[in-house]
């Protein structure tokens, strides 16, 4: 139900990467505007993105307050220029989002290989500890700070002359691997949360290869 010139939002979808979280919906508004509300299961509704003509709303500031909580959002539709108008039931038209638990559902962003260093037949590969928008004591936490040992990294590494990808994993941000002397290797990493059943893996980092600027070689 609702007034004849408003339609309810639909296809409410959470888009979240490393806790940067945006609610998207349809349709593009024609003679209507939207307001979004968000709440935890037990909390009060908080309004965001007032009377917007956008079909997305950045809810990051709300969800980072407690990433382990489960959130619900709803999108209200109002006639443009007459936001006091309500639906036939005496309330504005709205649609609920699916529930969203950031800790369990945010996508893992593409990791970056910060550096690699070869010492003899060992290579130390370091993954950049990406900063999130989650705060504690007024400082932004890294992905590792938030997920702790729940987060592992998988390293794929291969000789430049070969196609087979060897693997290693770490629950820190560093790998120490054995390599053949005199061979150049390429590296790619993936962030993984093994305890998840969906959204377990990030996309692969850009490939970095020995003999390029990012690495350092030391013969011992």
């Amino acid at each position: 139900s609702g007034t004849t010139n408003t339609v309810a939002a639909y296809n409410l979808t959470w888009k979240s990467t490393n806790f940067k979280t945006i609610l998207e919906w349809e349709p593009k508004p024609v003679n209507q505007v939207y307001t979004v509300q968000i709440s935890t299961k037990s909390g009060d509704w908080k309004s965001k993105c007032f009377y917007t003509t956008d079909t997305e709303c950045d809810l990051t500031d709300e969800i980072v307050k407690d990433v382990k909580q489960t959130y619900l959002a709803r999108v209200f539709s109002y006639p443009a220029g007459n936001v006091e108008s309500t639906g036939s039931a005496g309330e504005p038209l709205y649609e609920n989002s699916p529930e969203f638990t950031p800790y369990l559902e945010t996508n893992l962003g593409q990791p970056t290989i910060q550096s690699f260093e070869q010492v003899g037949t060992k290579v130390n590969v370091t993954v950049e500890d990406e900063r999130t928008l989650v705060r504690r004591n007024n400082t932004f936490l890294s992905l590792r700070d938030v997920f702790g040992k729940d987060l592992i990294y998988t390293l794929y590494y291969w000789k430049s002359s070969s196609s087979g990808k060897k693997t290693a994993k770490t629950n820190t941000n560093e790998f120490l691997i054995d390599v053949d002397k005199g061979e150049n290797y390429c590296f790619s990493v993936q962030a993984v949360i093994p305890s998840r059943t969906v959204n377990r893996k990030s996309t692969d980092s850009p490939v970095e290869c020995m003999g390029q600027e990012k690495g350092e070689f030391r013969e011992i």
Partner: antibody, heavy 120, light 107 residues
Framework: EVQLVESGGGLVQPGGSLRLSCAAS????????IHWVRQAPGKGLEWVGY????????YYADSVKGRFTISADTSKNTAYLQTNSLRAEDTAVYYC?????????????WGQGTLVTVSS | DIQMTQSPSSLSASVGDRVTITCRAS??????VAWYQQKPGKAPKLLIY???FLYSGVPSRFSGSRSGTDFTLTISSLQPEDFATYYC?????????FGQGTKVEIK
């Protein structure tokens, strides 16, 4: 419920080929890594290779390198093992298995296996 | 490749016995060792991962431990359904490798 079901085994002559399938249900293969492991009659377990369906990365045991190819079709949620230039010593039950972590090689779910017999 | 040397290759035991199977890695593998149980005509089942963690649904009579490059699977009180073959496996480096197996038979 997580399930892996292999198919495609059979009797093949030396030098022949077979394509084994591993159909997954209850999870999305691109979220995991799929391995193939084989077991010759009365013998122990031998790892064959893996595929990460999210990027196509693979690695093979030396004993099958250049002869076997692992692939995946994420739209069918299925992994494949293409076995070429088969030898008598490739006779085994072939299992596909899901990796519990990322690509560590710890296998939490296995298929029931499919028997490949290489004989003239 | 890393070799996993498993012993004994077979053992006979009675229901209620404490059974210990060991595996030695040819080089350091940290805690990257899993243990599997296999019954005839069936696929292996994961028992222990990361050397000492009991996999979900596995009875608590199974346990795993590590001392350097030596790894142990212990069954504290053998049950009739435990008669099977057990394999250790390292997953520290590619390729992962298995021990030769230990067949636990009824005495």
């Amino acid at each position: 419920e997580v399930q892996l079901v292999e198919s495609g085994g059979g009797l093949v002559q030396p030098g022949g080929s077979l394509r084994l399938s591993c159909a997954a249900s209850g999870f999305t293969i691109s979220d995991y890594v799929i391995h193939w492991v084989r077991q010759a009659p009365g013998k122990g377990l031998e790892w064959v290779g893996y595929i990460d369906p999210s990027n196509g990365f693979t690695y093979y045991a030396d004993s099958v390198k250049g002869r076997f190819t692992i692939s995946a079709d994420t739209s069918k949620n299925t992994a494949y093992l293409q076995t070429n230039s088969l030898r008598a010593e490739d006779t085994a039950v072939y299992y596909c298995a899901r990796d519990i972590q990322s690509v560590s090689g710890e296998f939490d779910y296995w298929g029931q296996g499919t028997l490949v017999t290489v004989s003239s | 490749d890393i070799q996993m040397t498993q012993s004994p290759s077979s053992l006979s035991a009675s229901v209620g016995d404490r059974v210990t199977i060991t595996c030695r890695a040819s080089q350091d593998v940290n805690t990257a060792v899993a243990w599997y149980q296999q019954k005839p005509g069936k696929a292996p089942k994961l028992l222990i991962y990361s050397a000492s963690f009991l996999y979900s649904g596995v009875p608590s009579r199974f346990s795993g431990s590590r001392s350097g490059t030596d790894f142990t699977l212990t069954i504290s009180s053998l049950q009739p359904e435990d008669f099977a073959t057990y394999y250790c496996q390292q997953h520290y480096t590619t390729p992962p490798t298995f021990g030769q197996g230990t067949k636990v038979e009824i005495k």
